[in-house]
Amino acid sequence: KSSNEATNITPKHNMKAFLDELKAENIKKFLYNFTQIPHLAGTEQNFQLAKQIQSQWKEFGLDSVELAHYDVLLSYPNKTHPNYISIINEDGNEIFNTSLFEPPPPGYENVSDIVPPFSAFSPQGMPEGDLVYVNYARTEDFFKLERDMKINCSGKIVIARYGKVFRGNKVKNAQLAGAKGVILYSDPADYFAPGVKSYPDGWNLPGGGVQRGNILNLNGAGDPLTPGYPANEYAYRRGIAEAVGLPSIPVHPIGYYDAQKLLEKMGGSAPPDSSWRGSLKVPYNVGPGFTGNFSTQKVKMHIHSTNEVTRIYNVIGTLRGAVEPDRYVILGGHRDSWVFGGIDPQSGAAVVHEIVRSFGTLKKEGWRPRRTILFASWDAEEFGLLGSTEWAEENSRLLQERGVAYINADSSIEGNYTLRVDCTPLMYSLVHNLTKELKSPDEGFEGKSLYESWTKKSPSPEFSGMPRISKLGSGNDFEVFFQRLGIASGRARYTKNWETNKFSGYPLYHSVYETYELVEKFYDPMFKYHLTVAQVRGGMVFELANSIVLPFDCRDYAVVLRKYADKIYSISMKHPQEMKTYSVSFDSLFSAVKNFTEIASKFSERLQDFDKSNPIVLRMMNDQLMFLERAFIDPLGLPDRPFYRHVIYAPSSHNKYAGESFPGIYDALFDIESKVDPSKAWGEVKRQIYVAAFTVQAAAETLSEVA
């Protein structure tokens, strides 16, 4: 339970007062307000929204609300020279062109400044050539093509379906395969749920709908021109040739009506198996090129987008802590959208707005949190997590010394089935205890706790009677806080019953059809799921900022470290002969995990027993908890990924959205059987085991008695 000592407040000002103040009707009203026009990063409309939020947060009662601006590299289509793809005949005549924009949703026909679908940061170019269908363009898809089917993508334009992995990884894989262009499309198999109508009659993707998105491979760098440092007024910027993470080949997204026209003519090899077939009425032939009658026809891309240094604006609100003002709990989510942002991000921004309003109401009644709470409305998340990363780069010294926790608040919903939580193991117990106190919004669970409905619908694969909590990956604004700075982080949202499609997003993701009406008509008419997410996110922030002892349980880290060590060991043991030949041992890692487990257990015992009325000892114990996540940071970073510095977790090298455990060892082992110099490759595995073992041991020692 929260404790309110030393914060000069009346007894009614507890977690219950905060939660009771949150209202579904307010979230609905805020969502409507935030979604009537586009709020693309770098535009006047998004600047105006930043100023509106600043003004409203001040009215709500925060101590200060400031705009923090940066000048970062963004990307826009050319307004007078649209991007499209053609099928051309042998004379070079365009016999088919893909669409120039999506048909606007009803009621939005006269809205100006709807950015047409494009792949942000695509270089300009007009490549033409034969098409190769590469399935999802995952690492394993290119292995299948190149190694098994002996199909060479060099000099070809590849067409890949969206889904399974982050689009930037698809583009990187295509580049490495030698492709000269990439077409991304949404297949109904991934973006059209059976039995549901297309928007505006349901929540499915229509044939003219297209997913926008950036195609960068930043690996946590933030602004491509100022990696490691804020893009401020005196910044030194790299030349575009040295910019971090930019794609080198043209890329463009299309919908499934256009994809049908490209794929129906495909010839060459048949698909290798049924996992390469989507739901269109086409053969899903791999190519290269078109079938007999159409073999002289080619595909040509016309990409004219430009990269421009543009000003962006974060909104940073502060609610000063009464007892430990130098300890920061951060709640942040982005404000910029591709178009209307009905789900992404405004379903999250509306929840943050209501959380701020509730905290402000308590503050006006005389309450303050024990620790300082920072609220953030990030800009340019869609262009590579730029706003959050630049702010964290600017404030890194403060954050690494004072950052207790970061709670992310992007989309509140991606479905309406059950809760989904990804967080540091330090927060498992916080999430469990909180959800046991909250009411489930789910049909059939009236009067039951959120914990109960969540556990029933999304059970943990390891522990019966507990819900699934996933690893943090990336693709959202917690990245810099967790992966670079080592600040304990978490995220929560309502999700779909669609585990197999985990990383594909909801059907209308990043399309023009992501509107207020989508949410209000189809996902959450009563806004009860939004309210539940507000209670989870807000409740976590309240506890983190207000509990006397930080609600972190280091024993849960010990449990997962053992699980991750077992997993990586079993991967390595697929090569028993090489492990013997090169004397590869995991003993040091298992020993470090054992030490961590014992020391964490002893620390937890001391945590129960110490004198909480002694402010020095209290602060000391809390600092050990706060700095535990920090202890997993390697200042040198992961190989070739200097801004991914967490040794236990990193975004997967094959899918930015997914988290990988012991990523240094995992990447060293990946496809090791194909390495030209096995001795060197296994040497790197041994080095990564050493780094991991050292880091776990060092982290354990931060929990030992200080003297």
């Epitope: 499209y84 669409s99 120039l100 009506y257």
Partner: nanobody
């Protein structure tokens, strides 16, 4: 309610030009592919031209290719057919029709028709 109203027909000499208009109301032209169809006296319906909602693709019947141009002004909710080098065999009632597929990329079936405008090509 949803309707299409054609205008611009008339009597014109062979070799001359005419521009037909089709004003759409009750729905946004910007979301729909549109067709021109014609019916010569005593004959069946003949499809003439189609343009996608965004203007990116135009398809024509062989009989009119190179002479007729379909276009639209989505801001005015109006479809056009520019007819050049008219011939006697172009004499017909010209109808505009809405394609039934929102955002369709190729001609499909029609779901809404206008009342038609008569074009007579005669010397």
């Amino acid at each position: 309610q949803v309707q299409l109203v054609e205008s611009g027909g008339g009597v014109v000499q062979p070799g001359r030009s005419l521009r037909l208009s089709c004003a759409a109301s009750g729905f946004p032209l910007i979301s729909y592919g549109m067709h021109w169809v014609r019916q010569a006296p005593g004959k069946g319906l003949e499809w003439v031209a189609f343009q996608t909602y965004d203007g990116s693709n135009r398809y024509y019947a062989d009989a009119v290719k190179g002479r007729f141009t379909i276009s639209r002004d989505n801001s005015k909710n109006t479809l056009y057919l520019q007819m050049n080098s008219l011939r006697a065999e172009d004499t017909a009632v010209y109808y505009c029709a809405r394609d039934r597929i929102v955002g369709g990329r190729v001609p499909d079936a029609f779901d809404i028709w206008g009342q038609g405008t008569m074009v007579t090509v005669s010397s």
